[in-house]
């Protein structure tokens, strides 16, 4: 699996989408997990509704939500109030029994917040609200991991 990078801004919401073949994964619940180290286990964060037919209902665990469009074949994860500690490698998974298939590997990058000071100059996003109260834009910029980029930089 290639790794897809999703970039969000600290304090804002980030939407991660994981497309899949709706026929191949028919009847399967989905999950969002966090990779613990490069070869470590993937720790479950949140999973879709226990009843597959209700997978469209948004389920929360803390600041993370999951919802599944089972007909369209898109799993959507929302990370609310993004913080630096949310940065890291995750997986979208399709569950069957005790097994899990990886739908997508996701690297979440948390960027500095251009709204964290007023004198931001060219930091402003065009067309975005200029107050915290009105700012509900969910930035979700994704790309593939570039050559030379490391999803797990060594910790010092």
């Amino acid at each position: 699996h290639n790794t897809t990078v999703f970039q969000g801004v600290a304090g804002q919401s980030l939407q991660v989408s994981c497309p899949y073949d709706s026929m191949k994964h028919w009847g399967r619940r989905k999950a969002w997990c966090r990779q613990l180290g490069e070869k470590g286990p993937c720790q479950r964060v949140v999973s879709t509704h226990n009843l597959w037919l209700l997978s469209f209902l948004r389920r929360w665990n803390g600041s993370t939500a999951i919802t599944d469009d089972t007909l369209g074949g898109t799993l959507t994860i929302t990370l609310r109030n993004l913080q630096p500690h949310d940065a890291g490698l995750y997986q979208c998974q399709s569950l069957h029994g005790s097994e899990a298939d990886t739908l997508r590997k996701v690297l979440v990058e948390v960027l500095a917040d251009p709204l964290d000071h007023r004198d931001a100059g060219d930091l402003w996003f065009p067309g975005e609200s200029e107050s915290f109260e009105d700012a509900h834009v969910e930035h979700s910029i994704s790309r593939s991991l570039l050559e030379g980029e490391i999803p797990f930089p060594p910790t010092s």
């Epitope: 801004v9 993004l82 940065a87 990058e109 960027l111 500095a112 964290d116 000071h117 007023r118 915290f132």
Partner: antibody, heavy 118, light 110 residues
Framework: DVQLQESGPGLVKPSQSLSLTCTVT?????????WNWIRQFPGNKLEWMGY???????IYNPSLKSRISITRDTSKNHFFLQLISVTTEDTATYYC???????????WGQGTLVTVSA | WMTQNPLSLPVSLGDQASISCRSS???????????LHWYLQKPGQSPKLLIY???NRFSGVPDRFSGSGSGTDFTLKISRVEAEDLGVYFC?????????FGSGTKLEIK
């Protein structure tokens, strides 16, 4: 011109709390910018610890998240660092600095050395 | 995670000096800007901002200092080293919400 000055005890015992004050003159901390704590370990390594912005919102380094708190006193134009359960690994020179997104850390205090030792 | 090279750079006064800084992640913000900055710390002093956003000299910084690079690879050049330039140079990024610094490069007399 804006000036920042750190103050606080130079010696802290292991397992106790480290508390520092940054006094800002020449600019109101509620007007703009994000007000940071950065530390420098012996051997020169710099570590960003976190900030409190003009509106009072805080962002912390995940490696310190469970131990750090940054607060402020707007009436005195001070902001504070509290680091709990310190060990000898927290011995460092602690700086306060102002972050402007475009310029990085354009203004720094002179730094205060904190030694953690029994 | 920022890697600086070399850790120590012995130079003769008047020489050109070049310091490299490499990031493990792209430093291009989603707004298109690259928040990579350079600082100089002289002995007994706090770091001072030299270059902001890759290549812009901060006020009062002599034009012998220049910055370049993009993405993950950046360079600070000093065209003719003077005695007052000696000290430790740090790169730093404020693109990602976890702000980080390079390990530092000590510029010293050969």
């Amino acid at each position: 011109d804006v000036q920042l000055q750190e103050s606080g005890p130079g010696l802290v015992k292991p397992s106790q709390s480290l508390s520092l004050t940054c006094t800002v003159t020449g600019y109101s901390i509620t007007s703009d910018y994000a007000w940071n704590w950065i530390r420098q370990f012996p051997g020169n390594k710099l570590e960003w610890m976190g900030y409190i912005n003009y509106s009072g919102r805080t962002i912390y380094n995940p490696s310190l998240k469970s131990r750090i708190s940054i607060t402020r006193d707007t009436s005195k134009n001070h902001f504070f660092l509290q680091l709990i359960s310190v060990t000898t690994e927290d011995t460092a020179t602690y700086y306060c600095a102002r972050w402007n997104g475009n310029y990085g850390f354009a203004y720094w205090g002179q730094g205060t050395l904190v030694t953690v030792s029994a | 995670w920022m890697t600086q090279n070399p850790l120590s750079l012995p130079v003769s006064l008047g020489d050109q000096a070049s310091i490299s800084c490499r990031s493990s992640q792209s430093l291009v913000h989603i707004n298109g800007n690259t928040y990579l900055h350079w600082y100089l710390q002289k002995p007994g002093q706090s770091p001072k901002l030299l270059i902001y956003k890759v290549s812009n000299r901060f006020s009062g910084v002599p034009d012998r200092f220049s910055g370049s690079g993009s993405g993950t690879d950046f360079t600070l050049k000093i065209s003719r080293v003077e005695a007052e330039d000696l000290g430790v140079y740090f790169c730093s990024q404020t693109t990602h919400a976890l702000f980080t610094f390079g390990s530092g490069t000590k510029l010293e007399i050969k």
